[in-house]
């Protein structure tokens, strides 16, 4: 998948664009909004009817090196009595994000953009039931 | 980040951390080609905390289209198909990295940007307090 070129319908390429070798692009990894703090709802992963846990994956050759993944705690959902109801399903909700991958080839280092699928949390769904003959 | 130990014959000039600016290949290593959540699953309709998906488009960003979830109800759908307001539909939010064209409109020059997206909704049992 290539990053789409800027469409002429939107705008002309400005003169001020930096020169970039063919087949590559310049990427500044100083993150915009890096220090923006978001107020996430506290403990939703524990209070949800489809609760989940978090695990941190670490890769020194990825930027950012730390990616947090959620895993649903149960197959079913937690009912009003606090018991698991397996007539319902806890399912993962996923979102793609971009990371930069560092690759070593001999003595040279190259960088590659990569899409990573992150499991963000879980939701409780009504299963679609099929009766097999 | 710390680099993996490499061939000892290589000159050790590389910074242990990622440099501030890198040249990257235009091809994105991508096993996950389906970016439309409506096509990937129907959880948004079958959840007890269903949500609608809104298209957010920005040609100055990659990906230019991001789908934002908005919970359909304040409460959650119970076994009878009615909204139970003793429970809460709550958005699950995630910070993701996208590319922002910088300088603006440039085809091959980007900066990473962190944005907060609502990915879906989950049903939550709130702790109840009676205010004196």
């Amino acid at each position: 998948r290539k990053i789409p070129k800027v469409g002429h319908t939107f705008f002309q390429k400005p003169e001020s664009c930096p020169p970039v070798p063919g087949g590559s692009m310049k990427l500044d990894i100083g993150i915009i909004n890096e220090n923006q703090r978001v107020s996430m709802s506290r403990n939703i992963e524990s209070r949800s009817t489809s609760p989940w846990n978090y695990t941190v994956t670490w890769d020194p050759n990825r930027y950012p090196s730390e990616v947090v993944q959620a895993q649903c705690r149960n197959l079913g959902c937690i009912n009003a009595q606090g018991k698991e109801d397996i007539s319902m399903n806890s399912v993962p909700i996923q979102q793609e994000t971009l990371v930069v991958r560092r690759k070593h080839q001999g003595c040279s280092v190259s960088f590659q953009l990569e899409k990573v699928l992150v499991t963000v949390g879980c939701t409780c769904v009504t299963p679609v039931i099929h009766h097999v003959q | 980040g710390i680099t993996i130990p490499r061939n000892p014959g290589c000159p050790n000039s590389e910074d242990k951390n990622f440099p501030r600016t890198v040249m990257v290949n235009l091809n994105i290593h991508n096993r996950n080609t389906n970016t439309n959540p409506k096509r990937s699953s129907d959880y948004y309709n079958r959840s007890t905390s269903p949500w609608n998906l809104h298209r957010n488009e920005d040609p100055e960003r990659y990906p230019s289209v991001i789908w934002e979830a908005k919970c359909r109800h304040l409460g959650c759908i119970n076994a009878d198909g009615n909204v139970d307001y003793h429970m809460n539909s709550v958005p699950i939010q995630q910070e993701i990295l996208v590319l922002r064209r910088e300088p603006p409109h440039c085809p091959n020059s980007f900066r990473l940007e962190k944005i907060l997206v609502s990915v879906g909704c989950t049903c939550v049992t709130p702790i109840v307090h009676h205010v004196a």
Epitope: S41, R42 | K70, L74, N88, V90, P126
Partner: nanobody, 116 residues
């Protein structure tokens, strides 16, 4: 700690209007939604109306749709319930509810009496 102050209850005739107000103070940040429930003796509390803080999306019980209107003032952390065309069956104790997603605060309630 969160405080909720309800006001505007009272006794009216059928067809009249009343406006309930609820003000939140204290650590009322990260509001999910703000709204009203009501309860009549011997019955469970029922949802009346709610407004989502992030986008002002509103939801109403079928029994009050078209007659009641909920609105909010973000700056003041207040929510109002405009009740028009009141009916005797609207008689109840009305409770303000402040919802912070995983924690919910209930007010003490204000009595609304509608006589025919």
């Amino acid at each position: 700690e969160v405080q909720l102050v309800e006001s505007g209850g009272g006794s009216v005739q059928a067809g009249d209007s009343l406006r309930l107000s609820c003000a939140a103070s204290g650590r009322a940040n990260s509001i999910n939604w703000f709204g009203w429930f009501r309860q009549t003796p011997g019955k469970e509390r029922e949802f009346v109306a709610g407004i989502r803080w992030s986008d002002a999306y509103t939801e109403y019980a079928n029994s009050v749709k078209g007659r009641f209107t909920i609105s909010r003032d973000n700056a003041k952390n207040t929510v109002d319930l405009q009740m028009d065309s009141l009916k005797p069956e609207d008689t109840a104790v009305y409770y303000c509810v402040l919802d912070l997603s995983t924690v919910r605060y209930w007010g003490q309630g204000t009595q609304v009496t509608v006589s025919s």
